[in-house]
């Protein structure tokens, strides 16, 4: 049990106050983290509170400003990047968001050696992506879907690609679906370790159907946003990978990297690129039916100036029970011999673990094992491998950092974080300097987050980087809800849940229950992290019990639970929420006439299906930006879990799993449907179709749209949204305003 003390004692009860909705909307109790921007084994940069860029040297204990806030302000810079030769800094301004990761910006280059901005051959604007080479101060950037190279910031650019065209051909940046569902980055270009070569992806979206929606703006006529967006079963982007020699870019030009034959025989995806050395590169490919992945190691042929990918260096990863990988196929971490690597994939018992691959996947040596999962490999050095897992004390919602000594035999394992601040910190990530000489630990909870600096050899804590003292002080007079993480065992399924309880919770009383659900494949909601958010307020001020449940399809508890939803989305996720609610009622403190469910995105889909389950358990519920039919969502995501919407594949379940098919069942619940009209991700179409089906079935419901808002419903819309949902729930639960 993880209890967050409410710190309520009778003597001070009168000075304590509950959370207010205003607290949440104002971000009064938000926390800070500290991620060093490492520039060597023992130095990092950090943007100070007053916006100076400061260099910290851990070993000398000295720090100094390398770029003043005055220089930053002169171009309204909000971000920066130091060149590896430490002579130049790019300054980023005019940030303009595009999709989840992508944005355009204006870039200025500041010359630290001369104390002035580089004049002549300035960068065009706006730029879609820009980065330094890993050595020296070469620049690669993407402008109007084409890639350019500068040998030095003041030099004229060399144009690498010429076929870039808006919404048609993307060079060095992903199209919509690759950005959101495959790469999870704004870029699709990769420098080799010493900057000799530049690899990049070209995405051809010429044949992809376009989603079009109105953006109302302020003009007399709305404009239409057009995005090539492949929905399930539609034509997909065609991807090619090229590599160019950046020292002599005009010599042979970009060379295409061949696709493995077993991949190229049908529709496929490129999933990631990892440089091993300047002359060895590793590409990962995935069949459109995403249960076969191929890792291909390619070598530069000096004589032909081409890239050779021998079949003997192809490693196949296949899933027979679900899709390949977790959310994504994992990426390799190469060892110092530049051919063997470490990678996370399912072991014979169906748990994701670290394996060492030297020649073939069949001969892989399993490095970690157990009924828990390895989650991320942070760093491999000559003698250590650092990774995170949820092994400790068998809580799947925790993350601890481990070190395995790979220099000695047998390898020994040490948990670096398990006992550091055990009550406060159970969910960590880490950031390592070169050669793992030092590292920062960022603890996200369950207590107040804290970031610390550690010695990479001894694991000794050197200093606290950020401990959120102001937040700690601000929370001293707040009646926070209590939180507990426990599990239910139902029909051989373990359902972990987090329950958020009002500060003066009394088991002998009855409370309204709100289920918050996401439930998407390979997600996890029950995590030991700190949060003061809307549901904290609902528990603290409005006296609700809130529960989050990780059912079938969720991550980090083995393939049996994860792949249970394969080809059957919308069934078990819903069943497991319902099962959990019944168990909560049995606990005796839930008012079974006041139970609600809400969710966003995939959670909106699950909450809608739960409300329409016909169980009579839920009085009301909210769906924010829900998927309503898998035929409306992106191919890469949807087909991973559902296969294709064709008669000979899985069309039947595509049709059976829609929200619209259950319109009649909404008759006996209060339903609030919410969506942004400019949602590029889960299109407004989804909610429009739910609304149409409900109207056609003559079922009353409530709805709210947010004009020109995307999937995140940000800015003033956030305030309006949470205020509106609060009123809806209070009305549903008969709570006074």
């Amino acid at each position: 049990i993880v209890l967050r003390p409410s710190r309520v004692h009778n003597s001070e009860e009168n000075t304590m106050r509950a959370l207010t909705l205003k607290d949440i909307l104002n971000g009064t109790f938000s926390y800070k983290t500290f991620f060093p921007n490492w520039i060597s084994g023992q130095e990092y940069l950090h943007q100070s509170a007053d916006n100076n860029i400061v260099l910290y040297n851990i070993e000398t204990g000295q720090s100094y400003t390398i770029l003043s806030n005055r220089t930053m302000k002169s171009v309204n810079a909000s971000n920066y990047g130091l060149s590896p030769d430490r002579q130049f800094v790019y300054l980023e301004s005019d940030y303009s968001k595009l999709w989840r990761y992508s944005y355009t910006a204006t870039y200025y280059i500041y010359d630290l050696s001369n104390g002035e901005f580089v004049r002549g051959n300035e960068l065009p604007r706006p730029i879609q992506y820009l980065c330094w080479s890993p050595v020296g101060s070469k620049l690669a950037y993407v402008y109007q879907n084409n890639i350019y190279l500068k040998q030095r910031p003041g030099d004229p650019p060399f144009q690498i690609t010429f076929n870039g065209r808006e919404n048609k051909i993307f060079n060095g940046i992903p199209d919509w679906v690759y950005e959101e569902e495959m790469l999870a980055t704004k870029y699709a270009l990769w420098w080799s370790p010493n900057g000799k070569f530049l690899a990049y992806a070209e995405f051809n979206d010429t044949d992809i159907p376009v989603i079009a929606y109105s953006y109302y703006g302020d003009e007399q006529y709305p404009r239409t946003i057009n995005i090539p967006y492949p929905k399930a079963g539609a034509k997909n982007p065609v991807v090619r990978i090229f590599i160019i020699d950046t020292t002599y870019p005009a010599y042979v030009g970009p060379q295409e990297v061949p696709v493995p034959a077993m991949i190229a025989s049908s529709d496929y995806y490129f999933s990631w690129l990892t440089w091993v050395t300047d002359e060895r590169v590793c590409l990962q490919w995935l069949k459109r039916v995403q249960n076969v992945s191929v890792l291909s190691i390619c070598d530069f042929r000096e004589d032909w100036q081409t890239w050779d990918c021998p079949k003997t260096q192809e490693h196949i990863e296949e899933s027979r029970t679900g899709w390949a990988g977790g959310f994504f196929v994992s990426t390799p971490v190469f060892s110092y011999d530049a051919i063997s690597y470490y990678k996370i994939f399912s072991d014979k018992d169906g748990y994701k673990h670290i394996h060492y691959i030297k020649d073939t996947v069949e001969n892989a040596i399993q490095i970690t094992s157990g009924k828990w999962e390895a989650i991320n490999i942070f760093r491999v050095t000559q003698d250590s491998l650092f990774y995170s897992s949820n092994e400790f004390e068998e809580y799947p919602g925790r993350r601890n950092i481990y070190r395995i000594s790979i220099g000695s035999y047998p390898p020994s394992k040490k948990c670096v974080t398990c006992h550091l601040r055990k009550e406060r910190c159970q969910y960590y990530t880490a950031s390592f300097s070169d050669y793992a000489k030092y590292y920062a630990l960022v603890c996200y909870g369950p207590g107040i987050p804290i970031s610390t600096l550690h010695d990479g050899r001894t694991d000794q804590e050197i200093k606290i980087l950020e401990e959120n003292k102001e937040l700690e002080n601000a929370l001293k007079n707040i009646q926070l809800p209590k939180e507990e993480i426990k599990k239910l065992e139902v029909d051989e399924i373990t359902l972990w849940y987090k329950m958020i309880l009002p500060p003066q919770f009394d088991r002998s009383k009855k409370y309204p229950l709100l289920i918050q659900v996401y439930g998407g494949p390979c997600s996890q909601s029950v995590r030991s992290v700190f949060a003061v958010n809307w549901i904290s307020y609902l528990a603290s001020k409005e006296g609700m019990v809130i529960a989050l449940v990780d059912g079938r399809g969720t991550a980090f508890q083995g393939d049996k639970l994860l792949y249970a939803v394969y080809r059957k989305l919308g069934v078990y996720e819903v069943e497991d929420q319902i099962t959990a609610v019944r168990k909560f009622i049995e606990m005796g403190f839930i008012d079974e006439k006041r139970i609600a469910i809400w969710g966003w995105s995939y959670g909106g889909y699950v909450s809608s299906l739960a409300l329409a389950s016909g169980t009579g358990l839920f009085k009301c519920g909210i769906a924010v930006a829900p998927v309503s039919s898998w035929e409306y969502y992106a191919s890469v995501y949807t087909e991973r879990f559902m296969g294709l919407p064709t008669k000979d594949d899985n069309l039947e379940h595509y049709k059976n799993s829609t929200v619209m098919a259950r319109a009649e069942y909404f008759r006996n619940v209060d339903y609030l449907l919410i969506h942004g009209t400019a949602d590029d991700n889960v299109h407004f179409q989804n909610s429009a179709q739910i609304a149409k089906a409900l109207v056609n079935a003559q079922v009353d419901f409530q709805a709210m749209w947010y004009s020109d808002q995307n999937h995140g419903l940000s800015g003033l819309s956030t305030n309006h949204l949470y205020t509106h949902m609060t009123h809806f729930l209070k009305q549903c639960f008969s709570l006074s305003d």
Partner: nanobody, 115 residues
Framework: QVQLQESGGGLVQAGGSLRLSCAVS????????MGWYRQAPGKQRDVVAG???????HYADSVKGRFTISRDNAKNTVYLQMNSLKAEDTAVYYC?????????WGQGTQVTVSS
């Protein structure tokens, strides 16, 4: 107050060698990442070599294999060993932190390579 005092420059024939020294004094130590920079007539000042606290070095492409940066922390001094000198190495050479701080530039030391 930080002072960086460069010395060791001079006139040398092409193919010859020089060793530059930089004495570091004041509130910083030579154990910090240090760099050598040069400014040729009518040109911008550029980084020539850099050395991190951990001992990793960086060299401009034009000097790779010819120049070597080193330090002696006991003497609080940073060195630049320059071999196989070329006419295009003619410049005023400066040392500074790496990356540099504007207020720390010294007078520099002139290196002239005659062909």
């Amino acid at each position: 107050q930080v002072q960086l005092q460069e010395s060791g420059g001079g006139l040398v024939q092409a193919g010859g060698s020089l060793r530059l020294s930089c004495a570091v004094s004041g509130s910083i130590s030579s154990a910090n990442s240090m760099g050598w920079y040069r400014q040729a007539p009518g040109k911008q000042r550029d980084v020539v070599a850099g050395l991190t606290t951990g001992g990793r070095s960086h060299y401009a492409d034009s000097v790779k294999g010819r120049f070597t940066i080193s330090r002696d922390n006991a003497k609080n001094t940073v060195y630049l060993q320059m071999n196989s000198l070329k006419a295009e190495d003619t410049a005023v050479y400066y040392c500074n932190l790496w990356p540099p701080v504007q207020g720390y530039w010294g007078q520099g030391t002139q290196v002239t390579v005659s062909s």
